[in-house]
């Protein structure tokens, strides 16, 4: 990626890392307002299976692994990208490596959920405080989960689906920070590992994933009031290990793997019309990206 200064634009969809033949170090940003892509500063170490989030206008890349011809190393790294300087800097590492991690942000703190280290599938969860550059373990999930989808709604952290080392999961659970405890919620209608999970209009959406046999294009959403999952329109492409984010009231899904191909497709969901549309293509196909949107 380019090492020049990034343009000072308002809200961009950032995609970091991913996998195509090997783990990638790309950082690219899509501007939905004009359909352009920016090539930004590479990650210092290639990684796939990472997660992305934004805190205080800074982009964080969390966990993953570097799968390269020279070897395969799971990552405990936390790296911070400053859009104003177009530079990455390392932060304190997590207590354990976490590939295929999920992350969520509550009150400016990053929660790192599940993931794997070698064949170990974590149920552990840790919280990062950016102002102190420190990680601390919190209560573990009730279930081991890698390829877990994580979302935050009403200051509660939801962990959805994934793989426990034996089975792909349709179960989901919710973390209550004040009580430091997890509780199971209603299971999804569909087993999903490697799904894209996000929050839009007071609902948790779970898009795509892998059910242990096939990649999925189905999408369902959880209404916290009724505690039910309901299907919405399916995506155009089946995909697992996809990236997902919300931008101006619409869901964007990026890349993934369809069982044959590493997708470059980016689709956008409009909840008003319950439709998906192809909006752009990434510069190359990839799975296992970390995605986040800059704050206003």
């Amino acid at each position: 990626g380019s090492m020049g200064h990034a343009p000072k634009v308002g809200r961009l969809i950032y995609t970091a890392g991913g996998y195509f033949r090997q783990s990638l170090s790309y950082l690219e940003a899509y501007n939905p307002s004009d359909g352009t892509w920016l090539d930004l500063a590479d990650l210092q170490v290639p990684r796939s299976g990472l997660a992305g989030c934004v805190v205080g206008g800074l982009l964080y890349a969390v966990g993953g692994r570097n799968n390269s011809p020279d070897g395969n190393t799971d990552s405990s790294a936390l790296d911070c990208y400053n859009p104003m300087t177009n530079q990455w800097s390392p932060c304190a590492p997590m207590s354990v490596p976490r590939n295929r991690i999920g992350v969520g942000v509550i009150d400016g703190h990053i929660y790192a959920v599940g993931g794997s280290h070698g064949c170990i599938h974590h149920n552990s969860v840790e919280r990062y405080e950016p102002e102190r550059d420190e990680w601390h373990l919190v209560a573990p999930m009730l279930t081991r989960r890698i390829g877990v989808g994580v979302a935050v709604l009403n200051r509660l952290l939801y962990a959805v689906g994934g793989f426990d080392g034996t089975n792909r999961l349709n179960s989901a659970e919710c973390y209550y920070p004040e009580r430091n405890e997890w509780r199971m919620i209603t299971a999804m209608n569909t087993i999903r590992s490697g799904a894209g999970v996000c929050v839009l209009h007071n609902c948790i959406y779970a898009a795509g994933g892998y059910d242990g046999q096939d990649q999925l294009n189905s999408v369902e959403r959880y209404d916290v009031e009724t505690e039910t999952w309901t299907f919405v329109a399916p995506m155009k492409h089946r995909r697992s290990a996809l990236g997902i984010t919300v931008h101006q009231g619409r869901i964007y899904v990026l890349g993934g793997y369809d069982g044959h191909t590493f997708l470059d497709s980016v689709e956008c969901y409009d909840p008003d019309t319950d439709t998906w549309s192809e909006v752009t293509r990434m510069t190359s196909g990839r799975s296992g990206v970390g995605v986040a949107v800059t704050m206003e």
Partner: antibody
């Protein structure tokens, strides 16, 4: 019946190429990670490569990285191992195997469905 | 790479004997160890996974245990069909590695 059947082995000259196939029946090859393991004549087992059906990620032993490519076609329920720049030390019986597809915990590493193997001989 | 040092490389035993085969990992592999049986000209068969879990359909005379980085396969009462070569395998970290094998022969 749950089974894997390899094919494509044979005699090839050093520097040559072969493509091995592993056809699954009785279950979906996408149900778990697919591995190739080889065994040189009179020797032990050596893990070669794997592919994750969920992410598409592949892993290779250092001895074959850059020369071998593992892939899968779920529509044909078949996995492949493309072997290029073959060397005498690649001579072996090649087995495909599935990790934990039928009850062995994937985290514990048990490969519980194996093919019968196909012999690859690299010699001039 | 993690080395799995298997011992003995061969042993002679009689039907009814108790047989113990050991694998020592060069570093921690948690419980991510499997054991296989292989007969000449055949593919390996899974016996034990996760160090001590008996795979479905495998006779209960086979058992596995772990003590730190030492892993043991025990055949409590050797049967004629058990004469074969046995391999351990770790899948804790990349790359997965096998022990060199133990050949169990008839005394």
């Amino acid at each position: 019946e749950v089974q894997l059947v390899e094919s494509g082995g044979g005699l090839v000259q050093p520097g040559g190429s072969l493509r091995l196939s592993c056809a699954a029946s009785g279950f979906a090859i996408s149900a778990s990670s697919i591995h190739w393991v080889r065994q040189a004549p009179g020797k032990g087992l050596e893990w070669v490569a794997s592919i994750d059906p969920e992410t598409g990620e592949t892993l290779y032993a250092k001895s074959v990285a850059g020369r071998f490519t593992i892939s899968a076609d779920t529509s044909k329920n078949t996995a492949y191992l493309q072997m290029n720049s073959l060397r005498a030390e690649d001579t072996a019986v090649y087995y495909c195997a599935i990790l934990g597809a039928w009850g062995a915990n994937a985290g514990g590493g048990g490969m519980d469905v194996w093919g019968q193997g196909t012999l690859v001989t690299v010699s001039s | 790479d993690i080395q799995m040092t298997q011992s003995p490389s061969s042993l002679s035993a009689s039907v009814g004997d108790r047989v113990t085969i050991t694998c020592r990992a060069s570093q921690s592999v948690s419980s991510a160890v499997a054991w296989y049986q292989q007969k000449p000209g055949k593919a390996p068969k899974l016996l034990i996974y996760s160090a001590s879990s008996l795979y479905s359909g495998v006779p209960s005379r086979f058992s596995g245990s772990r003590s730190g980085t030492d892993f043991t396969l025990t055949i409590s009462s050797l049967q004629p069909e058990d004469f074969a070569t046995y391999y351990c395998q770790q899948s804790y970290s990349f790359p997965s590695t096998f022990g060199q094998g133990t050949k169990v022969e008839i005394k």
